[in-house]
């Protein structure tokens, strides 16, 4: 372990499509991967007319986009499907949308996931 870095061993798991995919709907997912590579958690969601619909949450493989991110924050401006990743156990329990604007000051859009 590297000092000052939170290692990810488990993430919140959610699958909106659980019946079709034949998985659990929600739970805790242990994260596997090559021993020397970093592991992360992710969340994906949609914003349907202002209502937040979680699509999936779970483990994410080694990705420099997620390094040292303790919070799960989507920064892309108005994506079709929102995606964020983070490091640290269960760091994907909460997620938010904070688009990086070119000129204007960014405004935070915190997301409170609806319980399944």
């Amino acid at each position: 372990a590297i000092l000052g870095r939170s290692e990810t061993q488990e993430c919140l798991f959610f699958n909106a499509n659980w019946e079709k995919d034949r998985t659990n709907q929600t739970g805790v997912e242990p994260c596997y991967g090559d021993k020397d590579k970093r592991r992360h958690c992710f969340a994906t969601w949609k914003n349907i007319s202002g209502s937040i619909e979680i699509v999936k949450q779970g483990c994410w493989l080694d990705d420099i986009n997620c390094y040292d991110r303790t919070d799960c924050v989507e920064k892309k401006d108005s994506p079709e499907v929102y995606f964020c990743c983070c490091e640290g156990n269960m760091c994907n329990e909460k997620f938010s949308y904070f688009p990086e604007m070119e000129v204007t000051q960014p405004t935070s859009n915190p997301v409170t996931p609806k319980p399944p």
Partner: antibody
Framework: QVQLVQSGAEVKKPGSSVKVSCKAS????????INWVRQAPGQGLEWMGT????????SYAQKFQGRVTITADESTSTAYMELSSLRSEDTAVYYC????????WGQGTLVTVSS | QSALTQPRSVSGSPGQSVTISCTGT?????????VNWYQQHPGKAPKLMIY???KRESGVPDRFSGSKSGNTASLTISGLQAEDEADYYC???????????FGGGTKLTVL
Amino acid sequence: QVQLVQSGAEVKKPGSSVKVSCKASGYTFTSSYINWVRQAPGQGLEWMGTINAVSGSTSYAQKFQGRVTITADESTSTAYMELSSLRSEDTAVYYCARGGWFDYWGQGTLVTVSS
Amino acid sequence: QSALTQPRSVSGSPGQSVTISCTGTSSDVGSYNYVNWYQQHPGKAPKLMIYGVSKRESGVPDRFSGSKSGNTASLTISGLQAEDEADYYCGTFAGGKYYGVFGGGTKLTVL
């Protein structure tokens, strides 16, 4: 073990399109990216684009923008790369690779463009 | 993003060490630790050897090592063996906000 299995060789006419598939197994398909790379005969590797397998978000190399479409089907753990308006210079072996580090590769698919 | 620059070929005798360079710019190789090295034997798919500049991929012999100085990343192979004869490519991480790019490749000949 992680495996990426690609579809078979294709022979295409100039102006047509080709769609190459890449079926993943041995890991959770929706836990990373799938990248596409091509290699013309006797030439080096050329990055074409990537897809986030869970969100469907894509990025393409400028050279292929507007001509390439990368998609992913979660239900079958399969990624696809479609290249349109084919020309003879597109004759190459096309590879898919897992993740941002390209840590596992498919066996390659030879696409020959010839009239 | 423009291609990374590699020497066309390098050679060495068994047991010797060789170093392959990969030069980029201050905005890619110089700024981030995201350069990787791939080995490709004729007719085969490339194989990841080194990722994140200096991390050895699982199962890769410790004869292979990676480093970086300024805008140039390097792959060093010590104790050259006949099976090391192959093409070697440097490349960058690709995914999310990062776009991929490869070097032109270096042919390593073991004399």
